[in-house]
């Protein structure tokens, strides 16, 4: 459903981002070519592959909003 | 100094209903993902339920899903936790907790009994 | 759900000696952005549990440096160098790296 692809989505937002934009990068400064289209196909199957695989991730870890927060609360400022 | 006051706990039989508050001062709320633990008397703990700083993630336990729901004011600084169909087995102190375990309130017992 | 034992279920220990419990997962508490998210806890009778350490061996803060805590993967150890008065009451470990949180059953330290 949508919803869980946009649950999904945001689960993965952390650590797919720079890898996206590496990949991006990459295959934009490579001319069209035989080769370019190969590395766009395995970028696209890649993905779809991962989000099988994170999506069974995102069931068996904790998502990231439920974990220990970077800053203390205690060094936090008074309500 | 950070405080978490939980209120809302009593006796109520199988079946029944309590909802459970968490008053939150000393600290920015709104920043903070929160939990409520449970403790048995003289037993170990067990997590309840989990829910993020705006209150659109959520988790539960599985064997509270369908019955608990959590949920946030940040604009009143208060967690909430809305216990429905009650089972001896719920019986407990629930404690309010900061994601991460660092600050707990004192707790408030919930007893559910005929 | 993993689960966490820990051993001993209860010790006696002289003021001045050192304690060790240990903790023991039924999978690596390793969680995917590498951090491994183990915690120890301290419940003193009649009060509600505090954090000692997070992230395995990291103290908070105003915890004596006598508490360390230590492992990696799925086995973890709390040693307490030094016990004092204190120190008594029930020592818990927990995880939060997946998505159903446990704890351990507790282990009670006695000060002789």
């Known amino acids: 459903s949508e919803a869980e692809d946009a649950s999904l989505l945001s689960f993965m937002q952390g650590y797919m981002k720079h890898a996206t934009k590496t990949a991006k990068d990459a295959l934009s400064s490579v001319q069209e070519s035989q080769v370019a289209q190969q590395a766009r196909g395995w970028v696209t199957d890649g993905f779809s592959s991962l989000k099988d695989y994170w999506s069974t991730v995102k069931d068996k870890f904790s998502e990231f909003w439920d974990l220990d927060p970077e800053v203390r609360p205690t060094s936090a400022v008074a309500a | 100094q950070l405080q978490l006051v939980e209120s809302g706990g009593g006796l109520v039989q199988p079946g029944g209903s309590l909802r459970l508050s968490c008053a939150a001062s000393g600290f920015t709320f709104g920043t903070y993902s929160m939990r409520w633990v449970r403790q048995v008397p003289r037993k170990a703990l067990e997590w309840v339920s989990s829910?993020?700083?705006?209150?659109?993630?959520?988790a539960y336990r599985d064997s509270v899903k369908g019955r608990f729901t959590i949920s946030r004011d940040n604009a009143k600084n208060t967690l909430y936790l809305q216990m429905n169909n009650l089972k001896p087995e719920d019986t407990a102190i629930y404690y309010c907790?900061?994601?991460?375990?660092?600050?707990w309130g004192q707790g408030t017992q919930v007893t559910v009994s005929s | 759900d993993v689960v966490l034992t820990q051993t001993p279920g209860s010790l006696s220990v002289v003021p001045g000696e050192s304690a060790s419990i240990s903790c023991k997962a039924t999978?690596?508490?390793?969680?995917?952005?590498?951090?491994?998210?183990l915690y120890w806890l301290l419940q003193k009778p009649g009060q509600s549990p505090q954090r000692l350490i997070y992230q395995v061996s990291t103290r908070d803060s105003g915890v004596p440096d006598r508490f360390t805590g230590a492992g990696s993967g799925a086995e973890f150890t709390l040693k307490i160098s030094g016990v004092k008065a204190e120190d008594a009451g029930v020592y818990y470990c927990?995880?939060?790296?997946?998505?159903?949180?446990?704890f351990g059953q507790g282990t009670k330290l006695e000060i002789k």
């Open positions: 829910i993020s700083t705006d209150g659109g993630g959520t």
């Open positions: 927990a995880q939060d790296t997946y998505s159903t949180k446990t």
């Open positions: 907790v900061i994601a991460g375990y660092s600050d």
């Open positions: 999978q690596s508490l390793v969680h995917i952005d590498g951090k491994t998210y």
